[in-house]
Amino acid sequence: EEELQVIQPEKSVSVAAGDSATLNCTVSSLIPVGPIQWFRGAGPGRELIYNLKEGHFPRVTPVSDPTKRNNMDFSIRISNITPADAGTYYCVKFRKGSPDVELKSGAGTELSVRAK
């Protein structure tokens, strides 16, 4: 059994331009200690979408369901979606350190944007 699971249940999400998109992610445990970050794209050129600790992400809101008992919910909502937001979004767990170390990524959720 895997020690840590990062689960992005939807492979794809389609949203009309101007609407909000919810990207779901649950993590099986708070341990190992460390942050969750959201990225668009993979590899060295990936774009940071949300990091709780630092940065300003005015269109992104955490929308966790704190009642979930068996895992931690690190879902986010992105408001006012535009075609430029299309892409694959990854929920990534890090282990706390100096610097933080990437441990595991979710499988990704592809966001497509429909015309209004």
């Epitope: 445990s29 190992p32 200690v33 068996n70 895992n71 690190f74």
Partner: antibody
Amino acid sequence: EVQLVESGGGLVKPGGSLRLSCAASGFTFSSYVMSWVRQTPGKGLEWVATISSGGTYTYYPDSVKGRFTLSRDNAKNSLYLQMNSLRAEDTAVYYCASSVDGSAFDYWGQGTTVTVSS
Amino acid sequence: DIVITQSPASLAVSLGERATISCRASESVDSYGMSFMHWYQQKPGQPPKLLIYRASNLESGVPDRFSGSGSRTDFTLTINPLQAEDVATYYCHQSSENLPWTFGGGTKVEIK
């Protein structure tokens, strides 16, 4: 029914060692984060150590770091706390506790008493 | 370290009335919209028992006269109505990303 049964407590002299064990049953031990929490009349509840479900990651407060070592054997549904260089202030009831999400302590054992005294 | 100040240290409440216990953390224990503060009940000679997880969620099997509220640094456990079997010591516990995890000093609840 979830059961956590601690053993290994006792009287030990300052500087001595003890190994506490916790036998788990009634749940999927290998999926749970496990911890030890101790309780003294003077200091109340104090977190002592935590280990990830697979045993890769361990965490300790500064008060026991370098002296206590937490390990687990998922094949035996068992948790172990090796306590070295014991001090009088380590005297407490030691509880084994499970956590399904690594956050709150869901279940606790009945505790085992450790007394450090000359 | 995050210091948790729990108050009052002891509380006497009449049967059927409301008991309120507070915990204040020295810094926020919130992350991603979740508050990593939990509440436990301990009766004499027994281990602690989880009542409320993540500030306001009732653990399975716990009577709904127990409730939790709060966020960031200020949290409250409420027992309403208080019953005889609720006589115990209650502890709050923070498990935020900022180790070490810490507990409040406890509140002893008695019947007036």
